[in-house]
Interface confidence: low
């Protein structure tokens, strides 16, 4: 991707020294999605904008890292900067306009990953299953599992078969599926995120 990382760096480099310090402090207490760790405080406070961008992307990956950065900026009262970051991140990806905010994290069911929350909708609405399989093959799907899903006759039955393997997945594996969904059917993910 790269675009999100550049947008995060651009936003952080435009903060004053005092704002950057405030950003780091807010980052220590901002609510995180379940399954994501917090950047250790001692490491965080000594970082410049470039190091912090690398850490944000390393900890949260680009998509969530940009979203989290925008949330913190908004919390600091820097609405315009947050909007610019989201606009730059979503440019050309068919995502919602920057003004539309994702629902607050507290609204999500605690402990449930996005793909578990929206299991029924994903089974019903995902059409590009083959693409997902290719993205997940060798990472979270074995050859046997890959073939088993492909053998199903319809997209819903393919997705149902795919979901039969997810109870054994950890958060990271589920994130891979979510990432693949974002890349193949971003409009569907955004629709579900707003629901």
């Amino acid at each position: 991707m790269g675009r999100a990382r550049d947008a995060i760096l651009d936003a952080l480099e435009n903060l004053t020294a005092e704002e950057l310090k405030k950003f780091k402090l807010k980052l220590l207490s901002v609510p995180l999605r379940e399954g994501y760790g917090r950047i250790p405080r001692g490491a965080l406070l000594s970082m410049d904008a470039l190091d912090l961008t690398d850490k944000l992307v390393s900890f949260y990956l680009e998509t969530y890292g940009a979203e989290l950065t925008a949330n913190v900026l908004r919390d600091m009262g820097l609405q315009e900067m947050a909007g610019q970051l989201q606009a730059a991140t979503h440019q050309g990806s068919g995502a919602a306009p920057a003004g539309i905010q994702a629902p607050p994290q507290s609204a999500a069911k605690p402990g449930l990953h996005f793909i578990d929350q929206h299991r029924a909708a994903l089974i019903a609405r995902v059409t590009n299953v083959e693409w997902l399989l290719d993205a997940l093959y060798g990472k979270v799907l074995t050859d046997e599992q890959y073939q088993a899903v492909r053998a199903e006759p319809t997209n819903p039955s393919k997705m149902r078969k795919l979901f039969s393997f997810t109870p054994a997945w950890n958060w990271t594996c589920k994130d891979l599926l979510l990432q693949a969904l974002r890349e193949s059917q971003s409009y569907l993910v955004e629709d579900l995120e707003r629901s």
Partner: antibody, heavy 119, light 107 residues
Framework: QVQLQQSGAELARPGTSVKLSCKAS????????LSWVKQRTGQGLEWIGE????????YYNEKFKGKAILTADKSSSTAYMELRSLTSEDSAVYFC????????????WGQGTTLTVSS | DIQMTQSPASLAASVGETVTITCRAS??????LAWYQQKQGKSPQVLIY???SLEDGVPSRFSGSGSGTQYSLKINSMQPEDTATYFC?????????FGTGTKLELK
């Protein structure tokens, strides 16, 4: 699969230095932090510090500043820890461990290197 | 530094028994806690991360819970292969700090 291969056991004299290595394979070296952990015989674990190869910026436990120097060689996917001015207190098993940032834990560990400091 | 107080220091349990190990942090660590198992002469291995997430391949008899400063590791049905030393570790702040360890033996 992910592997962290540490260098062999070391016997060193007090006052000297030693450099331990940890060769990573099976993953993108620059994408994860590598930590070093000390364990004295029959005792607990102490975090020495972490090096994050992408930005080559080590963080140290204050207790080990000046004692340990952490470096990383991206070309060989190897992390190093040099221990200086050795004393008997440095006799321990030293582990390198990959820091999985998305859960704040060490998901893979090296087999450990035993350091004995004795005259 | 954040202090991690682990208890008990040692315990013995029979096969099938439920075991609970606790860890108290000197300040709120916001779920940034992992539990490790270390068998004699081996490297530690992660069991639980982010306070309650089970690492891949770890038997489901292991579970983690807690929040704020209080956390615990539960082994639902003790097995002979669970004989080991268990450590908690906080990663909320640098330096990362470990609990003193709990040595679990088979009764």
């Amino acid at each position: 699969q992910v592997q962290l291969q540490q260098s062999g056991a070391e016997l060193a004299r007090p006052g000297t230095s030693v450099k331990l290595s940890c060769k990573a394979s099976g993953y993108t070296f620059i994408s994860f932090g590598l930590s070093w952990v000390k364990q004295r015989t029959g005792q607990g674990l102490e975090w020495i510090g972490e090096i994050y190869p992408r930005i080559d910026n080590p963080y140290y436990n204050e207790k080990f500043k000046g004692k340990a120097i952490l470096t990383a060689d991206k070309s060989s996917s190897t992390a190093y820890m040099e221990l200086r001015s050795l004393t008997s207190e440095d006799s321990a098993v030293y582990f390198c461990a990959r820091y999985f940032t998305k859960g704040n834990y060490f998901d893979y560990w090296g087999q450990g290197t035993t350091l004995t400091v004795s005259s | 530094d954040i202090q991690m107080t682990q208890s008990p220091a040692s315990l013995a349990a029979s096969v099938g028994e439920t075991v609970t190990i606790t860890c108290r942090a000197s300040e709120n660590i916001y779920y940034s806690l992992a539990w490790y198992q270390q068998k004699q002469g081996k490297s530690p291995q992660v069991l639980i991360y982010y306070a309650n997430s089970l690492e891949d391949g770890v038997p489901s008899r292991f579970s983690g819970s807690g929040s704020g400063t209080q956390y615990s590791l539960k082994i639902n049905s003790m097995q002979p292969e669970d004989t080991a030393t268990y450590f908690c570790k906080q990663a909320y702040d640098v330096p990362f700090t470990f609990g003193t360890g709990t040595k679990l033996e088979l009764k």
